[in-house]
C-alpha cells in the first residue's frame, strides 16, 4: 500500500463530486522478479455498475502506448483482459472496488519508466480519469542465479548437461568438468529475457561438471555429478 510522502494524489473537481487517483511515486524491483504497481481511485458516480475499462499505459499520460487493458461488463466484477503486452501484465485489483493495481511479471531493465493508470466508465455515466504523474518503476540489475542444472540422456547412450541462469544483465555461462585441458565447450543460447541457458552436449567422462554464471554484479556456481555404473547408464547428482 502506498502511504506518506510517496503518494501522488491527483484530482479534479467535477460539477458535483470529485475524481481522484492515488499512486505511489515510485516502485522498486529487481530484474527477473515481479512488481506491483498500485493504483486506486475515487469517482463522483455513486453506485456506478455499468461497463468499465481499465487501462495502463507507459511513457506518458493520455498518449503513451497501452501495456494493459481490460473490460468489465455491466454488473460484473471480472475484468476481461483485452491487452497484456508480452503476456506479462495482470490486473490484481478490482476496478469495481476502485482498485486498478497491476502486477508486472518477469521484469527486465527495459521495463523501467513511468506507468499511468486510467479508468473509463462507458455506460450512462460517460466519464474517465487518468493519472497524470503516474508511478515510476525502477528495475534494478540482478546478480546471477542458477535456476536449473541437470544431466539428460543424449544420443547414442551419451549424456548432456543443461544449465539455466538468470540475471540482469544476462550472465555469461561457462561449463567446466573432468575433461583434460580447459573448460569444456558449451553451446550457449539466449533464453527468455533475463534467463540464459548453456548446454554441454557430450559428457565424455564421469565426474563433477560445474556451471558458472557471471555478470557485472557477481557470479554463481552449481555442479552436477555424472557416474555411470557398469554397463547401465545412470547419473548421480
Amino acid at each position: 500500500d502506498a502511504s506518506g510522502d510517496l503518494l501522488n494524489t491527483e484530482a479534479h473537481s467535477a460539477p458535483a463530486q470529485r475524481w481522484s487517483m492515488q499512486v505511489p511515486a515510485e516502485v522498486n524491483a529487481e530484474a527477473g522478479d515481479a512488481a506491483v504497481l498500485p493504483c486506486t481511485f475515487t469517482h463522483p458516480h455513486r453506485h456506478y455498475d455499468g461497463p468499465l475499462t481499465a487501462i495502463w499505459r507507459s511513457g506518458e499520460p493520455y498518449a503513451g502506448p497501452q501495456v494493459f487493458r481490460c473490460t468489465a461488463a455491466p454488473g460484473s466484477e471480472l475484468c476481461q483482459t483485452a491487452l497484456s503486452l508480452h503476456g506479462r501484465f495482470r490486473l490484481l485489483g478490482n476496478p469495481r472496488r476502485n482498485d486498478l493495481s497491476l502486477r508486472v511479471e518477469r521484469l527486465a531493465l527495459a521495463d523501467s519508466g513511468r506507468y499511468f493508470c486510467r479508468v473509463e466508465f462507458t455506460g450512462d455515466a460517460h466519464d474517465r480519469y487518468e493519472s497524470r504523474h503516474g508511478v515510476r518503476l525502477r528495475v534494478t540489475a540482478a546478480a546471477p542465479r542458477i535456476v536449473n542444472i541437470s544431466v539428460l540422456p543424449g544420443p547414442a547412450h551419451a549424456f548432456r548437461a543443461l544449465c539455466t541462469a538468470e540475471g540482469e544483465p544476462p550472465p555469461a555461462l561457462a561449463w567446466s568438468g573432468p575433461a583434460p585441458g580447459n573448460s569444456s565447450a558449451a553451446l550457449q543460447g539466449q533464453g527468455h529475457g533475463y534467463q540464459v541457458t548453456a548446454e554441454l552436449p557430450a559428457l565424455t567422462r564421469d565426474g563433477r561438471y560445474t556451471c558458472t554464471a557471471a555478470n557485472s554484479l557477481g557470479r554463481a556456481e552449481a555442479s552436477v555429478y555424472l557416474f555411470r555404473f557398469h554397463g547401465a547408464p545412470g547419473t548421480s547428482t
Epitope: 479534479h12 498518449a63 462507458t122
Partner: antibody, heavy 122, light 107 residues
Amino acid sequence: EVQLLESGGGLVQPGGSLRLSCAASGFTFSSYAMSWVRQAPGKGLEWVSTISGGGGSTYYADSVKGRFTISRDNSKNTLYLQMNSLRAEDTAVYYCAKAIGSSWYSDAFDLWGQGTMVTVSS
Amino acid sequence: DIQMTQSPSSVSASVGDRVTITCRASQDISDWLAWYQQKPGKAPKLLIYVASSLQSGVPSRFSGSGSGTDFTLTISSLQPEDFATYYCQQSYSIPYTFGQGTKLEIK
C-alpha cells in the same frame, strides 16, 4: 507510415446519399476511437460522430442524428460515414480523426486525414 | 451542450512576438481541452491536449494552461510558420465542441 486517407466525397443533390471511407494505416486501428469532423467552407470545425474502438458504441451530433451512420471494419482498418437525406448545410470538408490513447474516448484528435469535400446542391 | 468561446477572433502580430489566445467553456470541463492549428487547405494539427500536454513533435514555444472554464494557448516567440487559425476543443462530454477559431495574422 501512420496516416488516414478519406475518400467518397463529391457532389450530391439534396435528399441524396453518400458514403465516406477512411483508410487507416500505421497503427492498431481497433485500439482507438475514431471520429468524423467537418468544416463548412470558410467556417470553423464541427464534430459529427464518434465510434468506439470495437464499434459497439456510436455518438452523433444532433444536427446529423438519424441521417448519418458511423461504422468501422477493423479487419479492413477502415472507418465509414453513411450520409442519407443530405441537406445543403451538410456541405463541408469531412475529416476522419483518430482519438489519442483510448478506444472509447476522444481526449483529443491526434491524427487527421486530408479531408474529402462533400457538396450538397441542386 | 458545452459552448466554447475563443478570444480574440483574430490577432495581428509580428515574428518574435509573444501571443496569447484564450478559450472559455460554458461549464467546468476540468482539463479536457485540446488546441489545434490549421493552415488554409490543410487538416487541423494537434498542438496541446489535456489543457497543458504538448503533443509529440510540436515546438516547445507552444504551451497550454488552465483548468475548469478558462484556458490559454501561448506562443512564446512567433515564427513565420505559426501564422494560422487556432481552435480549442472540449472533450469533457459529448457532443465534443470547438471554439469558433482565432486567426493569427502577420502584422
